[in-house]
Each structure stands twice: as structure tokens, then as C-alpha cells.
Interface confidence: low
């Protein structure tokens, strides 16, 4: 629909992206040696938005390896049984329960690195991830509420006279749409998809002819995007009067000239009747003049000057309008 409609409008789009939250690791590689475990928070929960298709690395609390007994990753994803990945240091043994997603793995062998990686992040990875480190001093936790972000596809088109539609398709979470300048907007429509993404649609109308370019600004956690479109000028009362003024004036002038010549012809005929000694050439000239005048004013070959003037007037009018912001 959008593509078909966009062909009918002067489509000029640019986008400026403003990206937020740029990389994908929450781990500090240097393992902080904590002599006094009381300094380490026993329970840390982090809300973490991660963009889809990136790689994410989740890490455990910074506990020294020699103090470890067991490392457990607990993964709770929506609509799935809880998955646990366990490593026992004493037996150097790893065990998995209910873990079916091959994209969620240890970064390397747990004895080398206890971090968990998601490679790549998919929309189904929304959920809670928790690392539990068992030590002689007790258990230490680090939990992540992973929120998978999906960048919406943004489209902008003119659907009908001076009405623009901006869509942010399949974003997660829902994007927000605003317009510059503000128009007469219908309530924003939201369409929810089964995978958790949302399509947001905003339709606005601009009545005044002084607005030619409108910008749709889409705000989203993955970054902001702006598209603009030049609305087609519509034949409206004010504009039409301006555009057709040269033709109206031209018509009045022609009618005036034709009327004037017609009057001359009538008075000429009277002269002829009154004075029959008048030369024929004058009569012929008088009779021919209205026709010649008519032909010159209506034949395209003769009409170039006026056409060019009208065209220039029209271009200057449209040009001014298109560059009025």
C-alpha cells in the first residue's frame, strides 16, 4: 500500500538515527579479587535491554575461582521450563537440565570462564538469567532481566491529499511517533504481533497550504529515526486563484480586444453604408481584423509568450510553496 501511494507524492526521505546503548557485554573480564565477601552484594539484579541479532555476554559475580564450589546458570524464558546449566569444580563436571536453545552457551569451558553468551540474541531470549556462585562463604547471585529490543522498520507515505501515514513496523517495545509540524492526527493505532513486537501507525492531515514538508519522528530504545516527506500541493481555492490568475486576466484582455474590434467593425460597416466611395482594401482589412485577432489569441503557435509567462508564474508559485517550512 505504502509503495503504491508513495509514487503519487513527491517522495523525499532522509533519516537521522540516534543510537542508544551501544555494545553487548555486561562483564568485566578482570576477575575482581574480593578478600572480604561481605563487600560483594549477595543479590544483584540488572535490567538489560539488548538489541536483537547482537551477541550478548552475561557474567557471574566477581568471585575468585579458588573460592568456588559450584556455578549454576538458571534461565527462565517465557513459556518454557526453567533451564539450568551447572558446573561442579571438584569433579570438573557440567550438567544441563531442560536446556534446548543452542544459542545460549558458556563463553568457553566453565573452569576457564563462567560467563554465559547468547549468540546471537533472538526475540525468544526475553527472560530472566541468573548466575548462582556457591562458595564456602555462601551463595552469590547476579540476575539479568533481559529485554530483547527489535528495531522497527519505519515507513512514511502520503495516502491521500495532504494526509501522511507514518508506520513503525514490528518494533519491541512499541515505538513512539511524533510529527513536525503538528497536524490534525487520528489516534495512534497499535497492532500487536504474537512474537511480542508492535506496529505503530500514525495518520495526520495538514489543511493549510503553508505546510509543504512534514517530518515523522520515531523514538525507540534502539535509536531514533526521522523521515520527512514533501506533500503534494493540492488545487485549493486560494492556490487555484493564484495559479489561474494569469489566464483569467488574459481572457478578460482578449474579450475586451475582441469586443473593441467588434465595435470597430460595426462602426466600420456603418461608415461603409454611409460612404460607398471608401476603398475595398480598407473594408477587407476591417473584416479580416477580428478573425486575425481571434486566431492570434487562440492558436498555440501564437500563444507562446502568454504560455511561457503563465508557466513561469505557476513555477514560481509552486516553488515558493514547496520551500515554505
Amino acid at each position: 500500500e505504502g509503495a503504491a501511494q508513495s509514487n503519487n507524492s513527491l517522495m523525499l526521505q532522509t533519516s537521522k538515527e540516534n543510537h542508544t546503548l551501544a555494545s553487548n557485554s555486561l562483564c568485566m573480564d578482570e576477575k575482581q579479587i574480593t578478600q572480604n565477601h561481605s563487600k560483594v552484594l549477595a543479590e544483584v539484579n540488572i535490567s538489560w535491554p539488548v538489541q536483537m541479532a547482537r551477541n550478548a555476554v552475561l557474567c557471574c559475580p566477581p568471585i575468585e575461582f579458588r573460592n568456588l564450589i559450584v556455578i549454576t546458570w538458571e534461565i527462565i524464558l517465557r513459556g518454557q521450563p526453567s533451564c539450568t546449566k551447572t558446573y561442579r569444580k571438584d569433579t570438573n563436571e557440567t550438567k544441563e537440565t531442560n536446556c534446548t536453545d543452542e544459542r545460549i552457551t558458556w563463553v568457553s569451558t566453565p573452569d576457564q570462564n563462567s560467563d554465559l553468551q547468547i549468540h546471537p540474541v533472538a526475540i525468544t531470549h526475553d527472560g530472566y538469567y541468573r548466575c548462582i556462585m556457591a562458595t564456602p562463604d555462601g551463595n552469590f547471585h547476579r540476575g539479568y532481566h533481559l529485554q530483547v529490543l527489535v528495531t522497527p522498520e519505519v515507513t512514511l507515505f502520503e495516502s491521500r491529499n495532504r494526509t501522511a501515514v507514518c508506520k513503525a513496523v514490528a518494533g519491541k517495545p512499541a515505538a513512539q511517533i511524533s510529527w513536525i509540524p503538528a497536524g490534525d492526527c487520528a489516534p495512534t493505532e497499535q497492532e500487536y504481533w504474537g512474537n511480542g513486537t508492535v506496529t505503530v501507525k500514525s495518520t495526520c492531515h495538514w489543511e493549510g497550504h503553508n505546510v509543504s514538508t512534514v517530518t515523522c519522528h520515531v523514538s525507540h530504545l534502539t535509536g531514533n529515526k526521522s523521515l520527512y516527506i514533501e506533500l503534494l500541493p493540492v488545487p485549493g481555492a486560494k492556490k487555484s486563484a493564484k495559479l489561474y490568475m494569469p489566464y483569467v486576466i488574459l481572457t478578460i484582455i482578449i474579450l475586451t480586444i475582441v469586443g473593441f474590434i467588434w465595435l470597430l467593425k460595426i462602426s466600420g460597416c456603418r461608415k461603409y453604408n454611409l460612404n460607398k466611395t471608401e476603398s475595398t482594401s480598407v473594408v477587407e482589412e476591417d473584416e479580416m481584423q477580428p478573425y486575425a485577432s481571434y486566431t492570434e489569441k487562440n492558436n498555440p503557435l501564437y500563444d507562446t509568450t502568454n504560455k511561457v509567462k503563465a508557466s513561469q508564474a505557476l513555477q514560481s508559485e509552486v516553488g515558493t510553496d514547496l520551500h515554505t517550512l
Epitope: H19, T20, S23, L26, W48, N113, G223
Partner: antibody, heavy 119, light 112 residues
Framework: QVQLVESGGGVVQPGRSLRLSCVAS????????MHWVRQAPGKGLEWVAI????????YYADSVKGRFTISRDNSKNTLYLQMNSLRAEDTAVYYC????????????WGQGTLVTVSS | DIVMTQSPLSLPVTPGEPASISCRSS???????????LDWYLQKPGQSPQLLIY???NRASGVPDRFSGSGSGTDFTLKISRLEAEDVGVYYC?????????FGQGTKVEIK
């Protein structure tokens, strides 16, 4: 321990090019976003560019956009900054820095390499 | 771009006394996840900058507990409870909410 070592700085004429390198060690380089930050003599810090951990995305400061290119080779644990059409205002110490968390701090910085653009 | 404004630009402090630096952003740095994307750095004379505080109030690894960060939205403060000689240098705040990352002008802390 984590180390970042920059190289490639020097004196260069305006309009010429230079390539800076930053070799990383002591951590899993491919897991981290990396930045270039610069500091003109006697001035404050100015962010220059970032590259995603997998190289898929790059962003630049407006002042260098179109002239500088950030890249990385994860197999060599190396970050690069290709600087073209250099200007006098690009004179600065260039630091590479590791992105600690998503948008939350540069936790390790290199020692910096000085780039002087002068005729 | 988000503009970061620090005050004061120069701060002479007596050792053992507290110090406070203010940082203001031109737009809110509070993300919908509840974190403020503001960091504090210290650049000691002749050295590279080092991370002190991330996400508004979290001390980076190895940073002494005399440093603390507070604030939310657009107004942030870095406090040093008792200034030590090794704390002198230029302190910068930086926003990490959106590109381009932007720094404050810096606050030079020196011994009075």
C-alpha cells in the same frame, strides 16, 4: 590484566592520512564495543567513534564523519582508526577505550598516541 | 546532541576536606530501564582518564569508597568525602545514553 596499547601517531600535514592501531590484551576482545576518544592539547575529552563488538555497527562524531573510519580485527585483537583529510583541529592525543557495559562507561583506556597535524 | 555542563570549572580543596562537583545534562539521562546513563572520570596529570562512577551512582572496580555519585534525570553530583593528594586532576562527567557520547568541560581539582 587488561591492556590497551595505541600506536601510529605522529606529525602529518593537513589533507594527509594516518592510521592508528590499538592492540588489546587480557580480555575477550570480541565481546566488547570499543571507542576512540581524543583530547586536544590543554582541552577536554571528545568522543570520536565506536564500533560494535562484532564490527556490525559504527558511529562517529559529526566532526570526523566522512573522514575517519573505525574498524577492528577480532582475530588480531586490534582496533583501528583510519584518519583521512586531516585538519589542524584533529591535533590531539587519541585514546582507545573499552566499553564497560552497554552505554555505561569506558572502563579501560590506552595510554594514548599523539597526532599532530601541521604544515 | 546532549550537552553536558559542569560546575565549578576549578575547585581548590584542602586535603581531608570534602569536595563536590555538579554536572547538568541538556536532556534527561534516565533510561526506561531505571538507570541514569551518566559516568564520572578522573584524569590525573599526565595520565589517561579512569572510570570512577558508572550508571550515575555505581563505583567502578578498585575505586575508593570516598567517591560517590548521585542524582537523576538531568542533575548529577560527584562527591569526594575526604580529598587526598592523589585525587587531584580533572574530573569529567559523560553521558552514554545516545550517540554522540558527550563529555562535560571538566573540573580541575587542586590542593588548596
Amino acid at each position: 590484566q587488561v591492556q590497551l596499547v595505541e600506536s601510529g601517531g605522529g606529525v602529518v600535514q593537513p589533507g594527509r592520512s594516518l592510521r592508528l592501531s590499538c592492540v588489546a590484551s587480557g580480555f575477550t576482545f570480541s565481546s566488547y564495543g570499543m571507542h576512540w576518544v581524543r583530547q586536544a592539547p590543554g582541552k577536554g575529552l571528545e568522543w570520536v567513534a565506536i564500533i560494535w563488538n562484532d564490527g556490525s555497527n559504527r558511529y562517529y562524531a559529526d566532526s570526523v564523519k566522512g573522514r575517519f573510519t573505525i574498524s577492528r580485527d577480532n582475530s588480531k585483537n586490534t582496533l583501528y582508526l583510519q584518519m583521512n583529510s586531516l585538519r589542524a583541529e584533529d591535533t590531539a592525543v587519541y585514546y582507545c577505550a573499552r566499553d564497560r557495559i552497554v552505554g555505561a562507561g569506558f572502563d579501560y583506556w590506552g595510554q594514548g598516541t599523539l597526532v599532530t597535524v601541521s604544515s | 546532541d546532549i550537552v553536558m555542563t559542569q560546575s565549578p570549572l576549578s575547585l581548590p580543596v584542602t586535603p581531608g576536606e570534602p569536595a563536590s562537583i555538579s554536572c547538568r545534562s541538556s536532556q534527561s539521562l534516565l533510561h526506561s530501564n531505571g538507570y541514569n546513563y551518566l559516568d564520572w572520570y578522573l584524569q590525573k596529570p599526565g595520565q589517561s582518564p579512569q572510570l570512577l562512577i558508572y550508571l550515575g551512582s555505581n563505583r567502578a572496580s578498585g575505586v575508593p569508597d570516598r567517591f560517590s555519585g548521585s542524582g537523576s534525570g538531568t542533575d548529577f553530583t560527584l562527591k569526594i568525602s575526604r580529598l587526598e593528594a592523589e585525587d587531584v586532576g580533572v574530573y569529567y562527567c559523560m553521558q552514554g545514553l545516545q550517540t554522540p557520547w558527550t563529555f562535560g568541560q571538566g573540573t580541575k581539582v587542586e590542593i588548596k
